[in-house]
Every structure is written in C-alpha cells, then in structure tokens.
C-alpha cells in the first residue's frame, strides 16, 4: 500500500530571463527513493539516481542545474517554459509517486510564488 504524499511548490510564476527552483518532497513513507525523474510534459529534463547521481538531458544542459537537494533549477527562463512540470519519485517497495508543478513565466516583474500544496 502506498502511504506517501508528495509536497510540491505548487503553482509558481517567475520572470522571463530569471531562474526558478522546482522542489518536491516525499513524506509519510519509509520507502527508499531509488530515482527521481523531472519531466516537462513528455520531455525528460533530468534524473537523479541514488547510485549514479544527476544526469541532465543534453538538450537542457545549458539551462538546467541540479539541486538543491532533489530539486531542479531552471535558468534563463523564456515564455516557452510556461507549463506543467512533474517530479516522479521511483521508490522501493512502494512504486512511483508523481508531483505536479505549474510554472508561468511572465514578461513583467509581477511574478509571485504560489502556495504549496499536497498531492496524495
């Protein structure tokens, strides 16, 4: 039975040209995290594997940095970066937990962080 929950940074906004940290946190489970995948729609951005460390997909190497922790830092944001991002926690023995973050990249300086929320 999967008892864990993923807490994410939720709906967030940031300014064009700036950077943002995507964060997820898995709680309420003793399952071992073997790998975390970060995806944007159907594109793999990065992997953090417990044995091998971080791997950034080649097409994102210039604008994506690992961390902090299991989070992901997006740099040099463009309006095209607006959309859904997913943290996918592969765990043993529970299986897979997925968290969702919606990022809106704004032209102006009115970007504000949204509230944190939980996905069961």
């Amino acid at each position: 039975m999967m008892t864990g929950t993923i807490e994410t940074t939720g709906n967030i906004s940031a300014e064009k040209g700036g950077s943002i940290i995507l964060q997820c946190h898995l709680s309420s489970t003793t399952a071992q995290v073997t790998q975390v995948n970060w995806e944007q729609q159907d594109q793999l951005l990065a992997i953090c594997n417990a044995d091998l460390g971080w791997h950034i997909s080649p097409s994102f190497k210039d604008r994506v940095a690992p961390g902090p922790g299991l989070g992901l830092t997006l740099q040099s944001l463009t309006v095209n970066d607006t959309g859904e991002y997913f943290c996918i926690y592969h765990t043993y023995p529970d299986g897979t937990y997925t968290g969702r973050i919606f990022l809106e990249v704004l032209e102006s300086s009115v970007a504000e962080h949204g509230a944190r929320f939980q996905i069961p």
């Epitope: 992997i47 594997n49 044995d51 460390g53 971080w54 791997h55 690992p66």
Partner: antibody
Framework: EVQLLESGGGLVQPGGSLRLSCAAS????????MSWVRQAPGKGLEWVSA????????FYADSVKGRFTISRDNSKNTLYLQINSLRAEDTAVYYC??????????WGQGTLVTVSS | DIQMTQSPSSLSASVGDRVTITCRAS??????LNWYQQKPGKAPKLLIY???NLRSGVPSRFSGSGSGTDFTLTISSLQPEDFATYYC?????????FGGGTKVEIK
C-alpha cells in the same frame, strides 16, 4: 568472494567492433548499478558508461555516445559493452566496476582493447 | 561537465612522511568525492567515498576531508605499499569525472 572478470578485448581495426563482457560473482548483481571505466596507455582514468541495476537507464560519456552500448543480463550476472566504429583513441584497458554509495567499489582486472590497422 | 583538478601531479616522499593530495571541482559537488589508489598494471582500488568515509579494509592512515569544491586526501605516515598513483573522482553528476592523478614516488 566478490569478483568481476572482464573478457572480449583484443586487436581490432579502425571502424571495427567488439563486445566486452564482465562476469560478476559473489553478490546480488541485479541490486547494483554498474559502470565501465577506461584507461589509455600511460594516461588517467576516464568514465565511459553506466547502467542502473534494472537496466532501465543507461548513461554515456560524450566521447562514446552513439558508438558504445551498455547492457546487462541479470539472469546471467553479466554486464556488456558493445563498442562500434572504433577509433585509435579508444585504445585502452577497459574496466568494469560495481557502483555502491556513488563510488566504484569493486573493479575487474581489465581487458585491453587495441585499435590499430 | 564538472572538471576535477588534482595537485600535485607527482611528489616524492619517504616512508613515514605525511602526504597531502588536493582535488578541486569546477563547481560544488557537496561531498560526492571519491579517492582511488592504483598500482602499475593493476585495477584502481577505492580508498575513500563520499569525501571522508574510509572504505572497509583500508588502513586508517588514509583519510579524506572537504566539501563543496575543495577536497584533500591525507596519508598520515607513508608506508612502502603506498607508493602508487591516486585519483579523485566526483559522483555528483554524470559524466563522472576523474582528476588527472597524483603519482607518489619514493624519495
């Protein structure tokens, strides 16, 4: 005893292919990520490729991407490295290594690949 | 890719000497830094993992320290069997990268 034993090296012409094998014993092979590291004659160590325990994810150095393929058969306790389109600069001793705590804790004795016409 | 710079590239020392080898990463790698020893014609051997953890079976005269970008391997009292080449390696992100090596020779 925990052991890794490489085989499959040899002399090959530029553009040729080889398949390296690494037979594991003494531990639960499928529970560990594995990697290949090479060392050109008289040079330092260069990480080549790695694969997760299940085989579900594979990773490569830019210098070999598209030419080398790492794979594993957990039922046979064996790691493989298929190396194609070989170049003179691929001449090296190739080591397989077990990964634990994000380090290569057990190494094989190495197998020499020589690329020459 | 993360570059690892090791120094010195070689050193001469006597049995009983205290030897220090340094390794610098081009960006922070937290403590994902390993040290290996290699003797001629042999495979590398893991000495220290995660910057400061001594691998089981490795003599306690070997120690590692550091975090972020700067790391040190220390041999407190050099023994005859310690003459070898030492490599640092980062495992924070792929591709894993090694330092150029430090050859420890007999003075």
């Amino acid at each position: 005893e925990v052991q890794l034993l490489e085989s499959g090296g040899g002399l090959v012409q530029p553009g040729g292919s080889l398949r390296l094998s690494c037979a594991a014993s003494g531990f639960r092979f499928g529970n560990y990520a594995m990697s290949w590291v090479r060392q050109a004659p008289g040079k330092g160590l260069e990480w080549v490729s790695a694969i997760t325990g299940s085989g579900g994810n594979t990773f490569y150095a830019d210098s070999v991407k598209g030419r080398f393929t790492i794979s594993r058969d957990n039922s046979k306790n064996t790691l493989y490295l298929q190396i194609n389109s070989l170049r003179a600069e691929d001449t090296a001793v190739y080591y397989c290594a077990r990964v634990r705590n994000r380090a290569s804790d057990i190494w094989g004795q190495g197998t020499l690949v020589t690329v020459s016409s | 890719d993360i570059q690892m710079t090791q120094s010195p590239s070689s050193l001469s020392a006597s049995v009983g000497d205290r030897v220090t080898i340094t390794c610098r990463a081009s960006q922070t790698i937290i403590t994902y830094l390993n040290w290996y020893q290699q003797k001629p014609g042999k495979a590398p051997k893991l000495l220290i993992y995660a910057a400061s953890n001594l691998r089981s079976g490795v003599p306690s005269r070997f120690s590692g320290s550091g975090s972020g970008t700067d790391f040190t391997l220390t041999i407190s009292s050099l023994q005859p069997e310690d003459f070898a080449t030492y490599y640092c390696q980062q495992s924070y992100s792929l591709p894993w990268t090694f330092g150029g090596g430090t050859k420890v020779e007999i003075k």
